[in-house]
Structure formats: structure tokens, C-alpha cells
């Protein structure tokens, strides 16, 4: 028998520095977690102790903190090179700055193979990107060879900016011929490494003949066997075992997100490359693991540029940006409108001639807006200003919901109106009218939404049975502020871009902003 140790990360999202337990900015260093310096310590410790070790990343290193905003992926290549990753799969967020924003900082600079079997380049891009990413890579590990086959969510064109010259094929259809080819070349130990979410990971394990292990990402899935060491609640045991259609037991793993854990999976293969056993658990990278001094010193060196960036002007406002709780928790506020407009603008994707855009709606809990911005400082808006407005380091995500769920969400928005509670919703692409004289749960008297399948966008009444795409904070997608109905009833959830980054990009693009209160949210009394 031959034993392989797979160390894996996924959805690190720009958490190069250690973070607090909830993956936001580290405040009390003695209780902080993750970060590449700490990750390196643990990886090196395992590499020294065990003979056959692979360090793999399942995508979405890009996007999530000011590190990505400033360094645009150069930081990913630099520190992943320093940690000597063996392979990485492309995630949807790797395309956030377009194909050029992937090619130049990452694909050309990475000293490890970057993989995806289901992304096919066409047109002028085909020759430009040729060889910069691969469908698979065969790695010598000890006295054996291991094939790593990559895959990426086929929803990427709706979630990011891959452009028109990349085709995202069905994962299973694309993976099978690559695996078959490796098998004919006597590569009998094959890992599928990719970024399509836990449900697709399980399908790949079930359907792709010849895949021995699946290492996934995208859904931030936490798996654990035994008592979990932190706040994350396991979605299943680690590894999660799928019985394939041809009767094999295929381990599937993921390691939550944000570099908080290092996935640790030990696989035992027989001489024919069959998995005999698999066991392990994610390792919580808490403060009991010291940060590597040389990596930490490098982080501190790179940090300097970030501090300079946060005080630079992004754009100007010529109006007061009212982000006060007195406004945003009670009525339409122009800061809420600005943020929602930025959220929709960040999700403009013309992927279908029938639709002017794939999504038109935004909802945003008023309690998530933490500060106004005064225009009387020469109108200047900095990253620092925006960090005061959006201090929680969240993301603006894409969900699919039924109209009935949205109606429940808007009822929840005002079910205890007047107490300055955070669930009052700010909106974009939605016109809502509330009648507060009615009893809680029956206060929404009008709810119109902006059409997407139209050439001239207009507002139509919400249909209860229709499925709508909505952009919202990850906090709401996870049921925060009492929006349990969103968490329970959402049909799809894809994590999006860092909240501050979305707004800062919009302000930089617009140069001068002047958001108004324009009647998106109205109140009526009596019959409507």
C-alpha cells in the first residue's frame, strides 16, 4: 500500500494576514487565526513529518480584502509560490478582473500548475492563453505519479468577468475524457480538484469514472469528523464518502474558507491505484500554531502599500451620503441607494440577447450601513471612509429566490418597524410600498420589480411563483437579521465580491456621485 497526504485550501479570498475567528480583520492577535504565515508553519511541519505530501488549492484565492484591491492577484502568485503549492484549480473569482487580470498577475507568475479541464478558450484568446492553464497535471510524488484534473463552476460567466472567448463546459462531460486519457497512460491515482460547490463535487465523485478523490471549493463547505474545534457547523463527515456509479467509495473534501483551516486528508492506495482507506480532518489554524517569521516579515513588507492606498481618493461625492441609522433603518436612504446601485453595476453581465442583464434587484439590510460620509471634506471618498460604512468584511452575493420568499423578506423588513432595528431593507431595482397601519406580516401593499428579460427595463408586480435573481449581502443570504426565510428557501447561492471593493470600484468608475432619495421605498396609509 502507498499513502498520500493531501493538504488543501479553498476560497481563501485574499486572507493573507491572520484574521479574527469570523474571518474579519484581526483585532486581538492572541485569538487570531489563519493567514499565510501560519499556514506555512503547519504545511512545513507536515512536509517534514510525512513522505508523500501534496498542497492543493481549489480556487477563489482572488477577491475579499484590500490585498486584492491593491495587488490585483500579484499577492496570490507571490505567497502561493512561497508556500510551494503543488497545484491550483481556477475559481470563478479568478476572473473578477477579466482574463487579463488573471493572465498577467497569476497565470504568468505562478510557479505551480493552474488547472481547469472545462474551460476552453476560443478566438484570439486561444493562442494568448495557450499553456497558461492546463486541464490536468501529472505530478511525481515519492515513487508514484498522481494526476490532478481541474474544474471550474460553469456558472462563472454569471458570477464574474471571463469575457466572451472562454467557454465553460459541463464539468462531468469535460472531466471524463481527461481522466480516461490519464488512465490509458498508466496514471492510476487521480484527484479531481475544482471549484463548483459541494453538490457538484459529489456528482463528480459519483459520475466520473476513474476519479479517486475530489477536493472542492466554492460552497465554503465545512466537513468534520468528531467535535468541531471552532464555530463552523459541519455539513457532514470529513471525508464525505460518495459511492460512485461503478461501486467505488470516493472521498470528497472541502475546507470551509478564508484560510481558517488547512484540509488534511490521508489516502491509502493499493498497487493498482484503488483507494483502500481515507481519513483526516481540517486543521484549525489558531494561535497555537506560530506564524512563520520569514513569511510574516514578507507580509509586513507588502502591507506598507495597503496603508498608503486606504487614504487615497477614489472619487468624489457632491451630496451628503446619509448612512445614519436614523435614516437607513427607517426609510430609503441615499447611502443604501448608492450601495445597491454599485451592487447591480458590479453584476452587469450581458450573457444573453434576450436579457439586458441577468439580475436587476438588490436588497441590503439597513443595519449593515454603519456610517455616513460627509461631502464637506472636498467631496473626497477614500477606502478608509468606505471601511467605516461597511466594516464587516462581507461580500455581495448572488442568490435565486422565489417571489414568495422575497415577499416574506419585505414583510420581515417592517415587522417591528420603528425600533431602529437592522432588518429594514434598502433596495435597488425594487419599488416597495408599506402600510404600517396593517398588522405585521401583512404590511407590504405593493412590490414591483425591475424586469430583466426586456430591452427597456420597467417595473412589474412581483410574481409569487417566479424565480428571481437578487444581489444581497452574504449576511442576509446566511439568514442574518432574522431573514431565516432567505437562508431556508434560497434556490441557489453564489458568493460574490468584497463589499467595500464593489462600492469603491463603482465610485472610481463614476468619478463623481450624487445619489438621491427617489421613491424606491414608500409608506401609505389606509386603502391602496
Amino acid at each position: 500500500a502507498w499513502e498520500l497526504t493531501i493538504l488543501h485550501t479553498n476560497d481563501v479570498h485574499s486572507r493573507l494576514e491572520q484574521t479574527s475567528e469570523d474571518s474579519s480583520k484581526c483585532v486581538n492577535a492572541s485569538r487570531c487565526m489563519g493567514g499565510v504565515a501560519r499556514l506555512f508553519t503547519k504545511v512545513q511541519q507536515i512536509r517534514r513529518a510525512e513522505p508523500n505530501v501534496l498542497l492543493l488549492d481549489a480556487g477563489d484565492q482572488y477577491q475579499g480584502t484590500i490585498w486584492f484591491t491593491v495587488y490585483k492577484g500579484a499577492e496570490v502568485a507571490h505567497f502561493m509560490n512561497a508556500l510551494r503549492y503543488d497545484a491550483m484549480a481556477l475559481g470563478n473569482h479568478e476572473f473578477d478582473n477579466g482574463v487579463e487580470g488573471l493572465i498577467e498577475p497569476l497565470l504568468k507568475e505562478a510557479k505551480f500548475p493552474i488547472l481547469s479541464a472545462n474551460i476552453k478558450a476560443k478566438g484570439p484568446l486561444a493562442s494568448q492563453i495557450s499553456g497558461l492553464y492546463l486541464p490536468y497535471k501529472v505530478l511525481p510524488v515519492g515513487d508514484e505519479v498522481v494526476g490532478i484534473v481541474g474544474y471550474t463552476s460553469k456558472e462563472t460567466p454569471f458570477l464574474s468577468n471571463p469575457g466572451t472567448n472562454l467557454v465553460f463546459e459541463d464539468e462531468i462531460t469535460a472531466l471524463q475524457p481527461e481522466v480516461d486519457k490519464l488512465k490509458t497512460l498508466n496514471v492510476n491515482k487521480i484527484i479531481a480538484l475544482g471549484h463548483s460547490g459541494f453538490e457538484m463535487d459529489k456528482l463528480i465523485a459519483q459520475k466520473v469514472r476513474g476519479v479517486d478523490v475530489v477536493v472542492g471549493g466554492h460552497s465554503n463547505t465545512f466537513l468534520y469528523t468528531g467535535n468541531p474545534p471552532s464555530k463552523e457547523v459541519p455539513a457532514g463527515k470529513y471525508p464525505f464518502i460518495v459511492t460512485s456509479d461503478d461501486g467505488r467509495k470516493v472521498p470528497v473534501v472541502q475546507a470551509y474558507a478564508f484560510g481558517k483551516y488547512l484540509g488534511y486528508l490521508k489516502i491509502e492506495f493499493d498497487e493498482r491505484g484503488n483507494v483502500i482507506s481515507s481519513h483526516g480532518n481540517p486543521i484549525l489554524l489558531n494561535s497555537s500554531i506560530p506564524e512563520d517569521p520569514s513569511i510574516k516579515a514578507d507580509i509586513n513588507k507588502w502591507r506598507i502599500k495597503l496603508d498608503n492606498y486606504s487614504t487615497q481618493e477614489l472619487g468624489k461625492t457632491i451630496v451628503y451620503l446619509d448612512g445614519s441609522s436614523q435614516s437607513c433603518r427607517f426609510r430609503e436612504c441615499n447611502m443604501g441607494n448608492l450601495i445597491c446601485d454599485a451592487m447591480i453595476n458590479n453584476n452587469l453581465r450581458h450573457t444573453d440577447e434576450m436579457f439586458w442583464n441577468h439580475v436587476s434587484m438588490c436588497i441590503l439590510n439597513g443595519g449593515g450601513i454603519r456610517s455616513p460620509i460627509d461631502e464637506r471634506n472636498n467631496g473626497t471618498i477614500t477606502w478608509e471612509n468606505l471601511a467605516a460604512v461597511l466594516p464587516f468584511g462581507g461580500t455581495f452575493d448572488l442568490v435565486q429566490l422565489k417571489g414568495s420568499t422575497l415577499k416574506k423578506a419585505f414583510e420581515h423588513s417592517v415587522h417591528r418597524y420603528g425600533q431602529s432595528t437592522g432588518e429594514f431593507l434598502q433596495v435597488g431595482g425594487i419599488h416597495v410600498v408599506y402600510d404600517l397601519s396593517r398588522k405585521p406580516g401583512d404590511r407590504v401593499v405593493k412590490l414591483d420589480v425591475l424586469c430583466t428579460k426586456c430591452r427597456v427595463p420597467s417595473y412589474d408586480p412581483l410574481k409569487m411563483d417566479e424565480v428571481y435573481k437578487v444581489i444581497l449581502p452574504n449576511f442576509l443570504a446566511n439568514g442574518g437579521d432574522g431573514f431565516q426565510m432567505i437562508k431556508d428557501e434560497l434556490l441557489r447561492h453564489d458568493s460574490g465580491d468584497q463589499d467595500i471593493n464593489v462600492v469603491s470600484t463603482y465610485i472610481s468608475k463614476m468619478k463623481v456621485i450624487y445619489p438621491a432619495v427617489e421613491g424606491r421605498i414608500k409608506f401609505s396609509t389606509g386603502s391602496h
Epitope: 495557450s130 499553456g131 501529472v138 497512460l185 496514471v187
Partner: antibody, heavy 118, light 107 residues
Framework: QVQMKESGAEVKKPGASVKVSCKAS????????MDWVRQAPGQGLEWMGD????????IYNQKFKGRVTMTIDTSTSTVYMELSSLRSEDTAVYYC???????????WGQGTLVTVSS | DIQVTQSPSFLSASVGDRVTITCKAS??????LSWYQQKPGKAPKTLIY???RLIDGVPSRFSGSGSGTDFTLTISSLQYEDMATYYC?????????FGGGTKVEIK
């Protein structure tokens, strides 16, 4: 700068064994695998195998399996290639070559001529 | 094993000429192809890896292209010092296999 210095020429009788050394310098020895390639007089290049200096893991060309052994000495940053049961057709220049992150050979040793003759 | 066929086996060209050498693999090798230059009595020198990535210090007149099974090494303007034998190598899978070589002579 990256350098691979190989041991001197050897003359061996058929059936004997030869052990060629390759001392690496100018980089972190354990960061890169080492390949061995040979070239018979007037012929092309032939890949023999690969060794990982971290753990001594080896991948051999089946053609040489059972006759070739690659080993390492991390204390001296040296890789060894031993070929046994020598025959006249093993007369060749033997090269070590470092592999880069993509497992493509990038830097080569100067070569060691091994002559097998009775 | 993957077979690699290199052509031509010999070519003669003038200084300043554009020269191309091709390698064809018996199956798709995933851009995992490198090119080497070997002068008489010397060790090979690596020029290109991953089909088109130039090794540091190699003159820019050398370039690589191709994907799948067909690959090309181009010398845009042949120089005297380029007189050598050129080899390609597939390193997609084990065992690694070389092309038979192309001897480039100056007319």
C-alpha cells in the same frame, strides 16, 4: 548561480556497475527534482528517471527498471545514479538535469562519459 | 509511451533566415513540451518549457508555439552561434520522451 557538477569519466567492464554523482549548488537543493538523461555516441537523448531530493522518491523509465538506482545525499546536495549489469550499449554520456516548478528540465550538468568495454 | 516525432532531422539555412523546427506527439501532451539546444561536445541547454515559455537568459529570437500534438520552435533570425542540434521533449507523462533531434547547419 545554479550549477550541477558531475563526477569524472569512467571505464567499466560488461556486467559491472557504475555510480555517477551530481553535486548541485546555487539553489535550495530540496526545492527541485533531478532527472537523469543519457546520450549514446552520435545518438539522441534518452530520459532515464527522476528523483525527489526531499524524500528520495524515484520514477524510473521502465526500460532501466531493475538496473538503475537513484539516490541522494542532502548533506552534500548530491544526487547519485547507479546503473548495474552494464553492457556495451550503455556506453554514453550521462547527464543530470534539475527540473523547475513545471517538472521541465532547466539546468544541466556537464555530463559524465561512461565507457563499457571488455 | 508517447512518441515524439521531430522534423526535419537536418536543415541548412543562412544567417538571418527564419528557421522552424516541428515536433509532433502521438497524442495530446497538454502544452507540456520543452526545447533544448546542444552544441557538439557540450551538455544540452534549455531554451523553452511549457511550449512557449522562454528560459531566463535565452535570446528573444527563439520562440515556441503550439498546443495539443503539434509544436514549433522558431528562430526568427538565425545567428552563427545557433548552429547546433535541437531536441524537443514531452514531459506531460512518464516516461519523458525526446524527439529525434534536428541538426541546424549554417549555409
Amino acid at each position: 548561480q545554479v550549477q550541477m557538477k558531475e563526477s569524472g569519466a569512467e571505464v567499466k567492464k560488461p556486467g559491472a556497475s557504475v555510480k555517477v554523482s551530481c553535486k548541485a549548488s546555487g539553489y535550495t537543493f530540496t526545492d527541485s527534482n533531478m532527472d537523469w538523461v543519457r546520450q549514446a555516441p552520435g545518438q539522441g537523448l534518452e530520459w532515464m528517471g527522476d528523483i525527489n531530493p526531499n524524500n528520495g522518491g524515484t520514477i524510473y523509465n521502465q526500460k532501466f527498471k531493475g538496473r538503475v538506482t537513484m539516490t541522494i545525499d542532502t548533506s552534500t546536495s548530491t544526487v547519485y545514479m547507479e546503473l548495474s549489469s552494464l553492457r556495451s550499449e550503455d556506453t554514453a554520456v550521462y547527464y543530470c538535469a534539475r527540473t523547475n516548478w513545471d517538472y521541465a528540465m532547466d539546468y544541466w550538468g556537464q555530463g559524465t562519459l561512461v565507457t563499457v568495454s571488455s | 509511451d508517447i512518441q515524439v516525432t521531430q522534423s526535419p532531422s537536418f536543415l541548412s539555412a543562412s544567417v538571418g533566415d527564419r528557421v522552424t523546427i516541428t515536433c509532433k506527439a502521438s497524442q495530446d501532451i497538454n502544452s507540456q513540451l520543452s526545447w533544448y539546444q546542444q552544441k557538439p561536445g557540450k551538455a544540452p541547454k534549455t531554451l523553452i518549457y511549457r511550449a512557449n515559455r522562454l528560459i531566463d537568459g535565452v535570446p528573444s529570437r527563439f520562440s515556441g508555439s503550439g498546443s495539443g500534438t503539434d509544436f514549433t520552435l522558431t528562430i526568427s533570425s538565425l545567428q552563427y552561434e545557433d548552429m547546433a542540434t535541437y531536441y524537443c521533449l514531452q514531459y506531460d507523462v512518464f516516461p519523458r520522451t525526446f524527439g529525434g533531434g534536428t541538426k541546424v547547419e549554417i549555409k
